[in-house]
């Protein structure tokens, strides 16, 4: 019983109220003690005796200080589609939440009243919006150049492999089949499994970029069921950032070393203004792509030897813009001298392209100490990669204009996996569920 039990019951002063953890008993017209959580009032107070509390019986509880004659009954046992996240004790009710692969279709004050299984997208369709603890999955048809051959609540459309010689063309539900030569995998934004909300899914739990639902999601007319078929294959995504980052870092170091050497030769101080642009991917305007939709400007101090890069996929529909793109420390808008700016933007490569060009430009200003007019100490240019890979509708040699005092160091790189693949969406079929479409 509370500490003030020795003083209760007592008659409150006219117009006064009872103290904390006390209640006013109408019958006794006295302030009496409440019972603590886990107990209930076995005997109510009188003018001469205080409340008598007793522990709650099994499967009953009280969560608050109270004067109820009986404890509350714990909720019924969790159903087979639920998980008991909080057991029934004398002080708290049982809480049931939906087990992995299910979501809460009907919630209650705490926990879930009714769970429903997350629906699966059938072959030819990928997840446009992942299921959450309280919402179902939304599917979309796979865009041209992508496919899904699984029945899954987590798999999104994956890019067709790029064949040197195609034996069987891919379609929405089947990957392309190549002849014996080794194929490469087109890396379309979102060519990964979806991130999964905690406690809603069991299979395919991989933290990966947010889904690319690219132009158009959840369109077309309804269609029907198909036999379940689990399993999927993930695509290589994480190395992309690493490749770009390492490339940027390398080029930055080369540029700095180059300028240091030139400075030693000419005995002129460096103007600490380094600008690194990594990479510049021309947008595929021919397919209505959105181009670099999110550009993150990340700054690093001059002494920093690393560059935080962030790859962003252009997507029109359901995607969590920053959910899986944590901003690097100090990632603020770059301004002023002595900063390295790294901006990345996503674009599409043409469906049949053999590679995505990455234009890496390192601009190094070498300044004269006297009048601050910079002199270009050197200009190096190198081009590598597949010249056929430039997306249609964008200039093949898209150059950043340089002023006379800037040193250009341009490089086009091609990785075995195309950095960014097609984000085209399959236009809607009527009768096709939720077909995605490009902007008109």
């Amino acid at each position: 019983l509370p500490a003030q039990v020795a003083f209760t019951p007592y008659a409150p002063e006219p117009g006064g109220t009872c103290r904390l953890r006390e209640y006013y008993d109408q019958t006794a017209q006295m302030c009496c003690s409440k019972c603590p959580p886990g107990q209930h009032a076995k005997v109510f107070c009188t003018k001469t005796s205080d409340t008598v509390c007793d522990s709650c019986e099994d499967s009953t509880y009280t969560q608050l200080w109270n004067w109820v004659p009986e404890c509350l009954s714990c909720g019924s046992r969790c159903s087979s589609d639920q998980v008991e996240t909080q057991a029934c004790t004398r002080e708290q009710n049982r809480i049931c939440t939906c087990r992995p692969g299910w979501y809460c279709a009907l919630s209650k004050q705490e926990g879930c009243r009714l769970c429903a299984q997350l629906r699966k997208c059938r072959p030819g369709f990928g997840v446009a919006r992942p299921g959450t603890e309280t919402s179902d999955v939304v599917c979309k048809p796979c865009a041209p150049g992508t496919f899904s051959n699984t029945t899954s609540s987590t798999d999104i459309c994956r890019p067709h492999q790029i064949c040197h010689v195609v034996a069987i063309p891919g379609n929405a539900s089947m990957d392309a089949v190549c002849t014996s030569t080794s194929p490469t995998r087109s890396m379309a934004p979102g060519a990964v499994h979806l991130p999964q909300p905690v406690s809603t899914r069991s299979q395919h739990t991989q933290p990966t970029p947010a889904p690319s639902t690219a132009p158009g999601t959840s369109f077309l007319l309804p269609v029907g069921p198909s036999p379940p078929a689990e399993g999927s294959t993930g695509d290589i995504v994480l190395p992309v950032g690493l490749i770009v980052g390492v490339t940027a870092l390398g080029l930055l170091i080369i540029g700095v070393v180059n300028c240091v050497i030139m400075t030693q030769v000419k005995k002129k101080p460096l103007c600490l203004q380094r600008e690194t642009k990594v990479p510049h991917l021309p947008a595929d305007k021919a397919r209505g792509a959105q181009g670099p939709e999110q550009q993150h400007l990340l700054t690093t101090v001059p002494s920093s030897s690393s560059s935080s890069l962030e790859s962003s996929a252009s997507a029109l529909d359901r995607r969590a813009p920053t959910r899986n793109q944590p901003q690097a420390p100090g990632a603020e808008k770059a301004s002023g001298a002595g900063e390295a700016r790294a901006s990345t933007g996503s674009s599409d490569s043409s469906p049949g392209g053999h590679g995505t060009q990455v234009n890496v430009t390192c601009i190094v200003n070498v300044c004269s100490s006297s009048d601050h007019s910079s002199q270009c100490s050197s200009q190096a240019s190198s081009t590598m990669g597949d010249t056929d890979a430039s997306p249609s509708g964008s200039p093949k040699d898209e150059q950043v204009p340089f002023s006379k005092e800037e040193c250009a160091f341009r490089s086009q790189l091609e990785t075995p996996e195309t950095l960014l693949g097609s984000t085209e969406e399959k236009p809607l079929p009527l009768g096709v569920p939720d077909a995605g479409m490009k902007p008109s």
């Epitope: 997208c121 059938r122 369709f125 158009g216 079929p429």
Partner: antibody, heavy 121, light 110 residues
């Protein structure tokens, strides 16, 4: 039971405007793309417009682009088609249709019963 | 002028097998799923076939769909008088619009 009920059709003069509505029930409206499809008397089906489940994407047939606007109000479970600058050739039965999102378990393919729009002077 | 080409009419006697064709191109049927709809007089269209050859629940197995290259076909076996209706094929192209065939009016003779 899934139900789609179109309304708002009627007789209108060329150049006039009309707003069609489609009230949806029996399913989670906000999870499905929605379409308008029309059928001129004695003719075939013609797709008119589509709006994505979240209302952020809209696409139109060339024949109605710039004149018709598709929209939805997920809080009211209602699909709309605002038709402006109507022409005689827009005369048709207008159906609202629900996509089923490509689910493996949902065989429901649903159309409303249609509402007749007549454009005549 | 429909992008997907269907014969305007087809006919058969009860019990017969009738096939309705639908011709497109590589950019629509060749690359994507085909859907078939049945429209009985005075009613809204009803999905018969999706994903080229799958039937929604409730559609009799007398109806079957197939696709080869840029063409698709709907076969109706054991023809019945209640099958008399308009049949539409549908697909989609990369130009963002849903495509319908012009429709085939099926007549059950006798």
């Amino acid at each position: 039971e899934v139900q789609l009920l179109e309304s708002g059709g009627g007789l209108v003069q060329p150049g006039g405007s009309l707003r069609l509505s489609c009230a949806a029930s029996g399913f989670t409206f906000s999870a499905y793309g929605m379409h308008w499809v029309r059928q001129a008397p004695g003719k075939g089906l013609e797709w008119v417009a589509v709006v994505s489940y979240d209302g952020r994407e809209k696409h139109y047939a060339d024949s109605v682009k710039g004149r018709f606007t598709i929209s939805r109000d997920n809080s009211k479970n209602t699909l709309y088609l605002q038709m402006n600058s109507l022409r005689a050739e827009d005369t048709a039965v207008y159906y609202c249709a629900r996509s089923d999102g490509g689910y493996d378990s949902d065989s429901g393919y649903y159309w409303g019963q249609g509402t007749l729009v007549t454009v005549s002077s | 002028q429909s992008v997907l080409t269907q014969p305007p009419s087809a006919s058969g006697t009860p019990g017969q097998r009738v096939t309705i064709s639908c011709s497109g191109s590589t950019s629509n049927i060749g690359s994507n799923f085909v859907y078939w709809y049945q429209q009985l007089p005075g009613t809204a269209p009803k999905l018969l076939i999706y994903d080229n050859n799958k039937r929604p629940s409730g559609v009799p197995d007398r109806f079957s769909g197939s696709k080869s290259g840029t063409s698709a076909s709907l076969a109706i076996s054991g023809l019945r008088s209640e099958d008399e209706a308009d049949y539409y094929c549908s697909s989609y192209a990369y130009s963002d619009n849903i495509l319908f065939g012009g429709g085939t009016k099926l007549t059950v003779l006798g």
